[in-house]
């Protein structure tokens, strides 16, 4: 049964969801933050919660600016304890099939269990074969960075491109992107859409005897990977005399699919494979994500992992009040589904974490983008929300005036390091940066009343435009530095956010139905651009801008 | 605890055939290269035959090319090793090997023996 692991087929059936709803009419809805802060002299040091990390660094979550109070906090928690996210989480920790609509588990912690402990799949010890995917990256990594690893005409290795897309492509370019501050020796480049121009444009900055192609398909079917994968074989054998045995030196797999992979041309021994327990867009700490290890060292990807393990430790061990992600889970519940919030906005304000909420956005939209329980119900309540953001302060120059002044309620997540990379100029951008991460989160809460903007000079119809309503919800993630364990730690942290939402919608947060129609039609379409006949096949709107684009193809 | 054990060896007369299996528990297995290697008295172990993990492809050494069919269930966690043709110089201990993907990772069988004579 798709419901074994949860006794419930909706959420509203909650006792503790009833709760909830009469505690949002009698005093959440009119909650103001501002005046619980006045009320209660400790509500930021009860609200704010400090993660350490494995080697000690720290992430302060702070809480206290979100409309909530101690019994809002508590009806929450009694809401998880009822939903059995604790038990949901156990089952995936145990390795046990909780993605119940594929019958898989859903393993993704064990990939960065450092700590080699038994983690147990279908009876099998799973650590030992992680272990040994690792040491594999390790070495070949190694090889490579040093330049033990030669191209074709024996020339070092300078460049990697790595073809993949989803979640073969979109952890992997955050990732590199969040840490470039901590690349070395070679330059790493991203195709995945099957555009033309990606890989087009990536190919006139590369030199075939410097460049190692990294093709990330777990299948080695996927349609747009395969077709750049070729295009990139045809470029470089015509760039290095039609002669199939470099293709060795030059290409490597991370796929399970061995014989596609030596069809190819691939060396199999250069082939890194991931289990089926392992969803695309948990991917990343796998062996997907060996374009990281090559780019950042081997030794700062462990740290990434073990940054993410520290999470996963914290949230298994760590009870429910102090819990600092299912905590985050729960307030994304309490928008979601009391405010009637349908977005959470993500705005770091660290350029170098410019793709982290493109890559929360597919770990959320994907995961809890579900209408259906595990009951096998259609819910009555929403889900999945819509996350977006961009880097601050771009994105207070852009979108920030709808999250002030518009009609919808974002709760806002914010996120800054304390130490730049980069403290240039006596370390004046920094502080520029930082005061305005604090200055927005307060501007949000406290907003501007009509007596102030009339204090401030304003008259009449100008009056209005000028408030600021306020009490408009943040949660601050302030860490020391962002170092592969912080990422780690942070993107582990988003993970069992989103586990926590969906273990309270009662929805398979670990499958993804919902891109598989799109893919079908388009393989029908693509015979139909084929030829030149006229498509009449489809409905008027579909026929008709197919026919318009034949005519002007 | 991971286990391969060995079956299905014994005495066959020359020209006769054999199948061997390999039974694996405590692995992944579909993710696992499986092969059977050999090692006659007095000899260094060699390889007979591969079947990569998703069973699209077969490697022979030439000496059992056309004699011998290697294939797995990944059901039932089994390698085969289907010896047909058998000469005495077939004789040997028969080991099953699982190598994880293509990484350092690999699990050995105790052997079994095969003794073709007449």
């Known amino acids: 049964s798709n419901n074994s692991f949860t006794n419930f087929k909706l959420a509203t059936e909650l006792p503790a969801w009833s709760k909830l709803q009469k505690i949002y009419e009698s005093q959440g809805k009119t909650l103001s933050v501002k005046q619980e802060f006045q009320k209660d002299a400790k509500r930021f040091e009860k609200l704010n919660k400090t993660f350490t990390n494995y080697d000690g660094s720290k992430i302060l979550f702070d809480y206290s600016k979100n409309l909530v109070n101690d019994e809002i906090i508590a009806a929450l928690i009694e809401l998880a304890k009822e939903a059995n996210v604790t038990g949901l989480r156990d089952a995936m920790f145990k390795g046990e099939h909780i993605n119940s609509t594929e019958d898989r588990a859903v393993y993704h912690v064990a990939l960065r269990n450092r700590a080699n402990k038994p983690m147990y799949v279908d009876g099998v010890n799973v650590a030992p074969e992680v272990d040994s995917v690792l040491k594999h990256m390790k070495e070949f990594s190694e090889q490579v960075r040093s330049g033990e690893w030669k191209g074709y005409t024996g020339k070092k290795i300078t460049d990697v491109v790595n073809i993949g897309i989803g979640g073969s492509d979109l952890g992997p370019v955050m990732v590199t992107e969040a840490l470039k501050h901590y690349a070395g020796v070679l330059d790493v480049h991203f195709v995945s859409n099957i555009d033309g121009t990606h890989i087009a444009e990536t190919l006139k900055v590369v030199d075939p005897e410097t460049t190692l192609f990294l093709i990330a398909s777990k299948t080695f079917t996927t349609a747009e990977t395969i077709t750049n994968a070729n295009t990139a074989k045809n470029w470089f054998l015509s760039k290095t005399g039609n002669d199939p045995s470099h293709i060795a030196k030059h290409f490597a797999a991370l796929s399970t699919n061995e014989t596609e992979v030596a069809k190819f041309g691939i060396d199999t021994k250069n082939m890194f494979g991931f289990e089926s327990w392992v969803g695309g867009r948990y991917s990343v700490w796998s062996a997907i994500g060996l374009s990281v290890a090559l780019y950042i060292g081997y030794d700062n990807f462990e740290a990434f992992l073990k940054g993410a393990e520290a999470v996963d430790n914290h949230f298994t061990q760590t009870p429910l009040e102090d819990n600092i992600p299912l905590l985050g889970g729960l307030l994304s519940v309490w928008y979601n589904n009391f405010f009637g919030a349908q977005t959470h906005l993500v705005a770091p304000f660290d350029q170098y974490l410019h793709r982290f909420p493109a890559y929360l956005q597919q770990l959320s939209m994907e995961s809890n983008g579900k209408s259906v329980t595990r009951g096998n119900v259609f819910t009555d309540y929403s889900t999945g929300s819509i996350l977006f953001g961009e880097p601050a302060t771009n994105a207070q120059h852009s979108f920030f005036q709808l999250v002030h002044q518009g009609t919808k309620l974002i709760p806002s997540d914010f996120i800054l390091a304390a130490q730049s990379h980069n403290p240039i100029e006596n370390k004046l951008h920094q502080k520029m940066l930082a005061s305005n991460f604090f200055a927005q989160a307060e501007a949000l809460m406290v907003g501007k009343d009509e007596e102030q903007v009339k204090a401030e000079g304003a008259t009449g119809g100008l009056v209005p435009h000028k408030v600021f309503s306020g009490n408009r919800p943040t949660t601050s993630i302030l860490a020391q530095k962002i170092t592969p364990a912080t990422l780690g730690a942070l993107i582990a942290y988003y993970e069992h956010v989103t586990f926590t939402e969906g273990a309270i919608w009662n929805i398979n947060s670990f499958d993804q139905w919902g891109v598989e129609l799109g893919k079908v039609l388009a393989k029908v379409i693509g015979k139909e651009l084929d030829n030149s006949s006229t498509i009449s096949t489809h409905d008027a709107s579909t026929n008709g801008l197919i026919n318009q684009f034949k005519e002007w193809m | 605890q991971v286990q391969l054990v060995e079956s299905g060896g014994g005495l066959v007369q020359p020209g006769g055939s054999l199948r061997l299996s390999c039974a694996a528990s405590g692995i992944t297995f579909p993710s696992y290269r499986l092969s059977w290697y050999r090692q006659a008295p007095g000899k260094e172990r060699e390889l007979v035959a591969a079947i990569t993990s998703d069973g699209g492809t077969t490697n022979y050494a030439d000496f059992v090319k056309g004699r011998f069919t290697i294939s797995r269930d990944n059901t039932k966690n089994t390698v085969y090793l289907q010896m047909n043709s058998l000469k005495p110089e077939d004789t040997a201990v028969y080991y099953c090997?699982?190598?994880?993907?293509?990484?350092?990772?690999?699990?050995w069988g105790q052997g079994t023996q095969v003794t073709v004579s007449s």
């Open positions: 090997k699982a190598q994880y993907f293509s990484t350092p990772l690999t699990y």
